[in-house]
């Protein structure tokens, strides 16, 4: 026998169900067409006639296929915290979603019911952990040799930087200032003000021979097991 | 100008001013006539730590007191070659500025 | 030693066992000092170019790795002097054995 093609509405068989697109009528006890995205029931199906669908009206929407007598509405407009990342359409609702800076305290289905700040971290704090679309900012203390002076939710806690001399140390919310190229002061016999480093020679001059070896300028640096002085511990 | 005599030992003081001195290193340079200049070591005031060219381990030994900026070398078992003028200056890499310098004389 | 006129150029030499360039900050650890007679060494150049602020820039710091130069572009009678280099690259720390520059 040729495939029999049902035209809505139609009964269903017995124990069967109706098709993709497709719902049962209770009153009609019938299989009727579901209207599509943007569209919903203007007149619902009988025994002989099929469903009736029409288009949304403006700032309501359908977004799935439905047999719905109105179209749902819209959100409401986005608040100033927010931003519209998807506009009301006749298939779509509005989606608001927290702006830059802020973050989502209050979730719902699709977008951002309520928005929050992100926290600033103060100086001598940094961020910790970032924030998030859903979670807020995690500050924490600068630790020794590192430094954040400014209110930042974004900022991490930076090290110092490092001085051949220093004339201010840093701290959790300084970063250490550095004498060099500062002007020199007069000095006592055995006092010492603000260094500052040259090296002299002309042709090849030996260095005293070290028993560790490091580089040597003609007659310039031992190398031993210290590490490269430029990174050397202390400030 | 320290006159010393052989065997005996001599401490060297260094006051600084000027910047921070328990934040940054302190160095010392011995210096004899016509034999350049030579690195003794340093020290980091704020905790101690020392870095000596293996040459003056044993002859040198370098100290701090953070309370009166002051950086101290003293010299053992002097001998003749121990003459010279040393110098204190602070520096993690080059010497910015350099104290005077304080001439040990060691003679019997 | 160099004996040199006033208004003369002159350039010195300094060299390397082992490269004084870090490759993290690309800087070659190597200082100049002036030493006038009587006086502590002055500190004129650092990172093997750069100059002391106050420094006349008749006195220029150059080369890397192993091989570098003090230029004094226009020797002026107050530049007499012992200068020395001196690596900064790792301790122990050590200098050149120095030029003397006499003023003819």
């Known amino acids: 026998l040729p495939a029999q093609v049902a035209f809505t509405p139609y009964a269903p068989e017995p124990g069967s169900t109706c098709r993709l697109r497709e719902y049962y009528d209770q009153t009609a006890q019938m299989c009727c067409s579901k209207c599509s995205p943007g569209q919903h029931a203007k007149v619902f199906c009988t025994k002989t006639s099929d469903t009736v669908c029409d288009s949304c009206e403006d700032s309501t929407y359908t977004q799935l296929w439905n047999w719905v007598p109105e179209c749902l509405s819209c959100g409401s407009r986005c608040s100033s915290d927010q931003v519209e990342t998807q506009a009301c359409t006749r298939e779509q609702n509005r989606i608001c979603t927290c702006r830059p800076g802020w973050y989502c305290a209050l979730s719902k289905q699709e977008g951002c019911r309520l928005c929050a700040p992100l926290r600033k971290c103060r100086p001598g704090f940094g961020v910790a952990r970032p924030g998030t679309e859903t979670s807020d900012v995690v500050c924490k203390p600068c630790a020794p040799g590192t430094f954040s002076n400014t209110t930042s939710s974004t900022d991490i806690c930076r090290p110092h930087q490092i001085c051949n001399v220093v004339a201010i140390p840093g701290n959790a919310s300084m970063d250490a200032v550095c004498t060099s190229t500062s002007p020199t002061r007069s000095m006592a016999p055995g006092a010492v003000h603000l260094p500052q480093p040259v090296s002299t020679r002309s042709q090849h001059t030996q260095p005293t021979p070290e028993p560790s070896t490091a580089p040597s300028t003609s007659f310039l640096l031992p190398m031993g097991p210290s590490p490269p002085a430029e990174g050397s511990t202390g400030d | 100008p320290e006159l010393v005599a052989p065997g005996a030992s001599v401490k060297i003081s260094c006051k600084a001013s000027?910047?921070?001195?328990?934040?940054?290193?302190m160095n010392w340079v011995k210096q004899r006539p016509g034999k350049g200049l030579e690195w003794i070591g340093r020290?980091?005031?704020?905790?101690?730590?020392?870095d000596y060219n293996g040459n003056f381990r044993g002859k040198a030994t370098l100290t701090a007191d953070t309370s009166s900026s002051s950086a101290y070398m003293q010299l053992s078992s002097l001998t003749s070659v121990d003459s010279a003028v040393y110098f204190c200056?602070?520096?993690?890499?080059?010497?910015?500025?350099w104290g005077q310098g304080t001439t040990v004389t060691v003679s019997s | 030693s160099l004996a040199m006129s006033v208004g003369q150029m002159v350039t010195m030499s300094c060299k390397s066992s082992?490269?004084?360039?870090?490759?993290?900050?690309?800087?070659?650890?190597l200082a100049w000092y002036q030493q006038t007679p009587g006086q502590s060494p002055k500190l004129l150049i650092y990172?093997?170019?750069t100059r002391l602020s106050g420094v006349p820039d008749r006195f220029i710091g150059s080369g890397s790795g192993t091989d570098f130069t003090l230029t004094i572009s226009s020797v002026q009678a107050e530049d007499l002097a012992d200068y020395f280099c001196?690596?900064?690259?790792?301790?122990?720390?050590?200098f050149g054995s120095g030029t003397k520059l006499e003023i003819e």
């Open positions: 990172f093997a170019s």
């Open positions: 000027g910047y921070a001195f328990s934040h940054s290193w």
């Open positions: 200056a602070p520096g993690r890499w080059y010497l910015e500025v």
């Open positions: 020290i980091h005031p704020g905790d101690g730590d020392t």
């Open positions: 001196q690596q900064h690259y790792s301790t122990p720390f050590t």
């Open positions: 082992q490269s004084l360039l870090t490759s993290s900050t690309q800087k070659n650890s």
